[in-house]
């Protein structure tokens, strides 16, 4: 079953290469287990950047070599992606799955365009 997912259209990463955005889903029921995946669509590729499964009210547990962190509050997930550089600029899509209890719901956001600008190197001081 389909579910609406909202996320900001544009986010500018900080000078330290950190980008944060909120992914909000319209839960049709009382889900207890939720899976959130961040997809990057750019360079003619689609990449699962990070994924987390969490029980409602608990911390997000990210899988594998995650460059993401996050917290949840109700139907909102606050996502942070770290270590970004200019080449990582692209469309980052939030995918939310309500895993338990049935029925299964899937929602995919329209994506957040994250712009990353590499900081200028500091000039050498004599």
């Amino acid at each position: 079953k389909a579910m609406h997912v909202a996320q900001p259209a544009v986010v500018l990463a900080s000078s330290r290469g950190i980008a944060s955005f909120v992914c909000e889903y319209a839960s049709p029921g009382k889900a207890t287990e939720v899976r959130v995946t961040v997809l990057r669509q750019a360079d003619s590729q689609v990449t699962e950047v990070c994924a987390a499964t969490y029980m409602m009210g608990n911390e997000l547990t990210f899988l594998d070599d995650s460059i993401c962190t996050g917290t949840s509050s109700g139907n909102q997930v606050n996502l942070t992606i770290q270590g970004l550089r200019a080449m990582d600029t692209g469309l980052y899509i939030c995918k939310v799955e309500l895993m338990y209890p049935p029925p299964y719901y899937l929602g995919i956001g329209n994506g957040t365009q994250i712009y990353v600008i590499d900081p200028e190197p500091c000039p050498d001081s004599d």
Epitope: Q45, V49, I67, M87, G90
Partner: nanobody, 125 residues
Framework: EVQLVESGGGLVQTGGSLRLSCAAS????????MGWFRQAPGKDREFVAA????????SYADSVNGRFTISRDNAKKMAYLQMNSLKPEDTASYYC??????????????????WGQGTQVTVSS
């Protein structure tokens, strides 16, 4: 480095399926991000798919997304590429590669320092 050997290539008709396998030996397989690349005659080598060290995260080229599935079995030191709905433009030599680095936003650009010898896939119309 790890040593990689691909298998499973062959001749298949348009719309058919193939499953490529990549057997690894040497270093700890689970320390490597794995990727599949392909090269058609007269063309540059191109990224096909990649999978993170535990197998939980994947990346696909737009041209194969929805048709190909990458997977791995760390216990068996194997990586796989399931190719469905094959098209003549999928004809190429397919190479398995290993990168001793973590996942990121652009796995196609990781430093893959181990490569197999390739297996030929030919899709006839």
């Amino acid at each position: 480095e790890v040593q990689l050997v691909e298998s499973g290539g062959g001749l298949v008709q348009t719309g058919g399926s193939l499953r490529l396998s990549c057997a690894a030996s040497g270093r700890t397989f689970s320390n490597y991000t794995m990727g599949w690349f392909r090269q058609a005659p007269g063309k540059d080598r191109e990224f096909v798919a990649a999978i993170s060290r535990s197998g939980s995260l994947k990346s696909y080229a737009d041209s194969v997304n929805g048709r190909f599935t990458i997977s791995r079995d760390n216990a068996k030191k194997m990586a796989y590429l399931q190719m469905n709905s094959l098209k003549p433009e999928d004809t190429a030599s397919y190479y398995c590669a290993a990168a001793p680095v973590p996942w990121g936003t652009r796995p196609s650009f990781l430093t893959y320092d181990s490569w197999g010898q390739g297996t030929q896939v030919t899709v006839s119309s």
